[in-house]
Interface confidence: low
């Protein structure tokens, strides 16, 4: 039923009136207005953005707005010994050297603080020895490089170009093979897109251009020192050396001209095919080391970097719900930037400010949502999700009890194009609903709807006459929510094409050139694709808060989880000897998926049609839809990952920001052939197959008829 | 300038082994990786393989298992030892050497010096 | 493996005339094909790589172009000495192969 029907407010505070709230020209404002300094996590700038935006929060009309702080761990750049890269002769003598900083774009070159390109949590060190070419670092390219290539990257520095994984996979992959350090650079292949200029006369990376970010392997853990509890006053810290995910190997990021300074002397085997090769006019060679003339010369990291404790700011507004105040909508991103934020995050955060706005505005005019929405600006999301999974291990327990869903908001756009959304599958119906409603905005879709548009441009591989909704990875801030503890969670903005631009992200991503103007100019001059957003993230809330009946469609679920198990099943497939040997059946999930489908399909008719004028079987209806996703948790957590609870999706173990479906199965199959003692590997597929067919049966009851 | 010349047995009997040597000069195996090809009689060329300059070495899948190239980078040699052959490896087989091309927006994979071949017949 | 296709095993031409050898791939291999002459005593000479590119000393008459799957040589103007066979041979992904190869009589 749609949210109209909420007993608390007049007619006219509907849905549409909030929508009709919503302004292009307030986000615009705000955006400039948060992106004129730089907000690094930790600083006093962030600080004081954090109380400016508690400030107006309070203006525009909910109910509390509090600062929650803790003490996390930090890295920076050391302020007088700057990071850099050298190629050194035999000699010792430095003959190249990377450079210390970006140059800053024009109007800019007065504003202080900006910190220099870094990869935060990087140990200190000075390395030096022979480069190797490693491609993107990913799992696959260390086979192509250790298995096939018979290349040896142990006692090396590697140099690997940005993309297609998370950084920090990168790193962890580079460790494991051996080596001592890791160069990240951007390749124009995959940050300069072909006929656009590069910034400030175009939204491609100019070659001095970098991209900071953090290299943690976190898996979810939060503050390094303060694994699985909020980092206050009283936390127990552990001790450096015992942190979470810190990297072991020294990391520097550089641009493509600093980068062509070090390729193109690569020497060695040749690089395996052109998937190893981007545009730069240098060999793609993967060495080990420098070719002929340039052999003895050798590469030479230093790096500086100190990891601190310091105090992070989150701000928490809250909007008190009238009929079910004990149940929590949250609309969440993040405020830290590495530098301007001019799209990450300030383009969410601008959006964030505007739906904060609109629902202040109705709640003014005598109008309550009919449950509790918290607003929150997250701080130290680039230094690992630091603020959300602090927050959310403090109020565990009520997130658990209470937390109807998630939707979080950081970038609205990482292109425009058309709509992206990754959700649970309890919002597919939701989203569906909501982007029928919603008018396009883009060219050659006027008047149409939303979902017509992003149908259109980004269809469902399955189903025909349907848009395309990814699944959940991690990366940002509704990881803590939906991996650790279960809350149904989704997200959305506008995003690239993704069929002509195969570059990763977009090209100026982490860099200084990420500024208002770099949106103003080249984006969203008209600000119609932020305002969509805020309509698609601020129709999601509105909904989920208001709706009478959950928006939760419980048969969307069913359908996904019979894929993931058709897929997990080919992927074991391909060792059927092994299956016969080792008796590994599949037999039982497809059972239980069976059954849930089922069990969801009669939930779904008694949800029709049950007495909604029941208060309690409301509730009851209610708490079953909202505690599903829950019934996905495993309180163990995935093997090594315990922050990972979710049996049905996990980030990639490959790829943070990719989600995988049924990990514990894949991750038991993945490169099974390669291991040591297959007895014991197959026997672990087997248990995770019990595990995801006690989970699935087990979620399924959740739905059954309650006596 | 730059040469190379294999020189092997001429006549193998079947399932023996065959072993060649490429001996190259003008230029350093350090810095050049080295191919293997192959033509049967009347027919077509065949890669057979490559040594890379750290000495990494990749095969043709076909033949992988009965192939093996090395060097010795300080006598400036090559080797291609191949297993239990059959009529049908009767061929001449040449070394080849990997362009270096530099300044150039890509990095391909062309051998630019070849060998003259060395003729192998393997009868009874 | 990538398949490398020469559908013409042998072609005729006088001298004088423009020729034409195509060479097609069992898939996309992004422009790394490159061409090869033997001449009848059997020594091998690279004359193009990447598609288009001229190996130095090959003269100005050979060229080559294509895309994706479709490549091919040019030869304007034949001379005698230009009576070989023809092998192309992609360089993007190992193993690398060689068409089955054209050969070119006057």
């Known amino acids: 039923k749609s949210s109209s029907e909420a007993t608390n407010i007049t007619p006219k505070h509907n849905m549409k009136a909030f929508l009709d709230e919503l302004k292009a020209e307030n986000i615009k404002k705000f955006l400039h207005n948060f992106t004129q300094i730089p907000h690094l996590a930790g600083t006093e700038q962030n600080f004081q953005l954090a109380k400016q935006i508690q400030s107006q929060w309070k203006e525009f009309g909910l109910d509390s707005v509090e600062l929650t702080h803790y003490d996390v761990l930090l890295s920076y750049p050391n302020k007088t010994h700057p990071n850099y890269i050298s190629i050194i002769n035999e000699d010792g003598n430095e003959i190249f050297n990377t450079s210390l900083f970006e140059p800053p774009p024009a109007g800019y070159e007065n504003v202080s603080d900006i910190v220099p390109p870094f990869s935060a949590f990087s140990p200190q060190g000075m390395p030096e020895g022979d480069l190797v070419y490693v491609n993107y670092a990913r799992t696959e390219d260390f086979f192509k490089l250790e298995r096939d290539m018979k290349i040896n990257c142990s006692g090396k520095i590697v140099i690997a170009r940005y993309g297609k994984v998370f950084r920090g996979n990168k790193v962890k992959n580079a460790q494991l093979a051996g080596a001592t350090g890791v160069i990240l650079y951007s390749d124009p292949a995959d940050y300069f897109a072909p006929g656009v200029k590069s910034y400030p006369d175009g939204w491609n990376l100019p070659g001095g251009g970098v991209q900071r970010g953090n290299i943690l392997n976190l898996n979810g853990a939060g503050d390094p020192l303060t694994p699985g509890y909020p980092a206050n006053e009283y936390a127990y810290r552990r001790g450096i050396a015992e942190a979470v995910g810190l990297p072991s190997i020294p990391v520097h990021p550089i641009g493509y001209y600093d980068a062509q300074k070090l390729l193109e002397k690569m020497g060695g085997s040749a690089s395996p095919d052109s998937s190893w090769r981007g545009s730069l006019k240098v060999p793609y060679n993967v060495g080990p080391g420098f070719t002929g003339n340039f052999s003895t010369q050798k590469v030479k990291m230093h790096i500086h970097s100190t990891s601190e404790v310091t105090r992070i700011y989150n701000v928490i507004g809250t909007l008190r719900g009238a009929v079910e105040p004990d149940r929590y909508v949250i609309l969440g991103g993040h405020r830290d930037s590495w530098v301007f934020g001019g799209i990450d995050p300030q383009s969410g955060a601008a959006v964030v400010h505007e739906i904060v706005r609109s629902f202040g505005t109705l709640k003014k005019e005598g109008w309550r949502p009919r449950r509790t929405i918290l607003f929150a600006s997250w701080d130290a999301e680039e230094f690992g999700l630091l603020g959300s999974t602090e927050w959310a291990e403090e109020n565990s327990r009520l997130l658990q009890e209470r937390g109807v869903a998630y939707i979080n908001a950081d970038s609205s756009i990482e292109g425009n194009y058309t709509l992206r959304v990754d959700c649970t599958p309890l919002m597919y119906s939701l989203v569906y609903n909501l982007t029928k409603e919603l008018e396009s905005p883009d060219e050659g879709f006027e008047g149409k709807s939303l979902y017509e548009s992003w149908t259109k441009k980004s269809p469902s591989p399955e189903f025909s006459g349907m848009p395309r909704i990814s699944k959940l990875g991690s990366g940002n801030d509704f990881e803590v929510f939906f991996q650790r503890l279960g809350i149904a969670s989704g997200r959305a903005r506008y995003t690239k094409n993704w069929e002509t631009n195969k570059f990763s992200s977009y090209p100026l991503y982490h860099s200084v050139y990420e500024t208002y103007e770099l949106v103003e100019k080249f984006y969203d001059p008209m600000f119609k694709y932020h305002l969509t957003v805020a309509q698609v993230r601020g129709g999601m809330v509105f909904e989920l808060a208001n709706s009478v009946v959950l928006p939760f469609d419980c048969r969307d679920y069913a359908v996904v989880l019979r894929k993931y198990a058709d897929k997990i099943y080919n992927i074991s497939m391909k060792h059927p000897q092994e299956m016969k040997t080792y008796s590994v059946s599949f037999d039982s999930l497809f059972s239980a998926v069976k059954n849930f489908t089922e069990i969801a399909s009669k939930f779904s008719e008694r949800l029709r049609d049950f007495d909604k004028s029941n208060p309690i079987l409301l509730r009851m209806m209610n708490d079953q839809l909202m505690f599903l996703e829950r019934a996905f948790i495993d309180p163990l957590g995935l093997p090594d990952r315990p922050f990972y609870r979710h049996v049905i999706y996990a980030p990639s173990s490959h790829n943070k920001y990719a989600g995988e479906s049924f990990p514990g199965i894949y991750d038991a199959l993945f490169d099974i052939e390669s291991k040591v003692d297959p007895s014991q590997a197959w026997g672990e597929v087997k248990r995770q197959i019990s595990i995801a067919t006690f989970t699935v049966q087990a979620a399924a009851e959740t739905l059954s008829e309650v006596a | 300038q730059v040469q190379l010349k294999e020189s092997g047995p001429g006549l193998v009997a079947p399932s023996q082994s065959l072993s060649i040597t490429c001996t190259v000069s003008g230029f350093s195996l350090t810095n050049y990786a080295i191919s293997w090809v192959r033509q049967p009689p009347g027919k077509g060329l065949e890669w057979l393989g490559v040594?890379?300059?750290?000495?990494?070495?990749h095969y043709n899948s076909a033949l992988k298992s009965r192939l093996s190239i090395s060097k010795d980078n300080s006598k400036s040699q090559v080797f291609l030892k191949m297993n239990s052959l059959q009529t049908d490896d009767t061929a001449r087989y040449y070394c080849?050497?990997?362009?270096?091309?530099?300044?150039?927006?890509?990095?391909?994979?062309?051998?630019?010096?070849w060998g003259q071949g060395t003729s192998v017949t393997v009868s009874s | 493996d990538i398949q490398m296709t020469q559908t013409t095993s042998s072609l005729s031409a006088s001298l004088g005339d423009r020729v034409t050898i195509s060479c097609r791939a069992s898939?996309?291999?992004?422009?790394?094909l490159n061409w090869y002459q033997q001449k009848p005593d059997g020594t091998v000479k690279l004359l193009i790589y990447y598609t288009s590119r001229l190996q130095s000393g090959v003269p100005s008459r050979f060229s080559g172009s294509g895309s994706g799957t479709d490549y091919s040589l040019s030869i304007s103007n034949l001379e005698q000495e230009d009576i070989a066979t023809y092998f192309c041979q992609q360089g993007d992904t190992l193993p690398y192969t060689f068409g089955g190869g054209t050969k070119l009589e006057i």
């Open positions: 080849a050497r990997k362009g270096n091309y530099y300044g150039s927006s890509l990095y391909y994979y062309a051998m630019n010096y």
């Open positions: 898939q996309d291999i992004s422009n790394y």
């Open positions: 040594i890379w300059t750290g000495g990494g070495t």
